[in-house]
Interface confidence: low
């Protein structure tokens, strides 16, 4: 019924993200760029800047129905593949060509920003079809806090907290050490609880990238790596 | 056993509205997509409307494009075509059907019996 709950897809602010729209139809029209056309709208979350709204350029689309207040048009495609969206045409959203011809208008950010955070509305129009895709897109912080912070010295301890800013809680949690991404498991060295990793004593063998990924139950994971700084023996 | 019963069609008035029920039991509808189709006499069976099983996915033949709407109802377990500016070319007989498929594009699993509908003045 209406106040239905739309689905969520959670992005990790920075990260690409992909806001499905899909037929999935292997017979879908060759010719579709040339008779049919897509818009995407966002109506950003409330206590978001609102974007100026574009000039809407796709004759021949289907009007949908009044934008509610904040709404306005990410991007469309007219028939003929003519582009139009907010002024300027921000470069981080992105409709594949080659998607479109196989009946895939999902729509990607590249990266996703904070301010992308809202409900998305797609209206895809086809010679004899009407496809309507609607979802909320929620952008989460990712951050890998270190206590204490700074420069470690050789024997000090440290514990490392890896947070993304989403209220349910991750259904697992991998640590990984250095630019080869080396699986980081509980030992003398290392002790992991959930989101925490605890180094006792730590030494220079230690310094360089400590990393977690935080995988969610919709499949969402985010990657969150650290800096770790320890002096040597000088 | 799934059954899908229509229900709502009737004798209608062009330019007059009907809303068809689609009553499901033996399964739980919101975890299917649900489609209308139609078969008028002497022409091949159509997808009218469809609901992905989210809800946030509807698809139409643009012949019943902005006249006709598909919902779904999860705490009746009951879909709906709301048919509005009924058309003579509208008439048919209805069915609703039921696929796990992600999209409608793959084959529906249950059928109903269909209902009649008939626009005429």
């Known amino acids: 019924g209406p106040g239905k709950e739309l689905p969520v897809v959670w992005a990790q602010e920075g990260a690409p993200v992909h806001l499905p729209c899909s037929l999935k139809s292997p017979n879908l029209d060759p010719n579709f760029l040339r008779r049919g056309g897509v818009i995407w709208q966002h109506q950003p979350d409330s206590g978001q800047p609102t974007p100026i709204p574009a000039l809407d350029l796709h004759q021949g689309m289907p009007s949908p129905r009044q934008p509610a207040p904040g709404r306005y048009t990410v991007l469309s495609v007219a028939p003929g593949g003519l582009r139009s969206g907010r002024q300027p045409l921000h470069p981080h959203v992105q409709l594949e060509e080659r998607g479109l011809q196989r009946g895939d208008f999902s729509l990607w950010l590249r990266p996703a920003l904070r301010t992308d955070a809202g409900e998305y509305h797609a209206t895809v129009r086809l010679p004899n079809r009407a496809l309507s895709c609607s979802l909320r897109l929620r952008v989460g912080q990712a951050s890998m806090i270190a206590s204490p912070s700074g420069v470690l010295k050789l024997s000090d301890w440290v514990l490392l907290n890896c947070s993304f800013s989403r209220p349910d809680r991750p259904v697992s949690v991998h640590w990984f050490q250095g630019q080869n991404r080396v699986p980081v498991y509980n030992s003398p060295r290392h002790f992991l609880a959930e989101t925490f990793l605890l180094l006792p004593q730590v030494s220079p063998l230690d310094s360089g990238t400590w990393g977690c990924v935080l995988t969610y139950r919709d499949g969402f994971n985010v990657s969150i790596t650290y800096n770790l700084k320890v002096l040597g023996l000088e | 056993q799934v059954q899908l019963v229509e229900s709502g069609g009737g004798v209608v008035q062009p330019g007059g509205s009907l809303r068809l029920s689609c009553a499901a039991s033996?399964?739980?509808?919101?975890?299917?997509?649900m489609g209308w189709f139609r078969q008028a006499p002497g022409k091949e069976r159509e997808l009218v409307a469809a609901?992905?099983?989210?809800?946030?996915?509807?698809d139409y033949a643009d012949s019943v494009y902005g006249r006709f709407t598909i919902s779904r109802d999860d705490s009746k377990n009951t879909g709906y075509l709301q048919m509005n500016s009924l058309r003579a070319e509208d008439t048919a007989v209805y069915y609703c059907a039921a696929t796990h498929y992600y999209t409608h594009r793959g084959p529906f699993d249950y059928w109903g019996q269909g209902t009649l509908v008939t626009v005429s003045s």
């Open positions: 609901i992905h099983w989210t809800s946030s996915v509807t």
């Open positions: 033996g399964l739980t509808l919101s975890q299917y997509t």
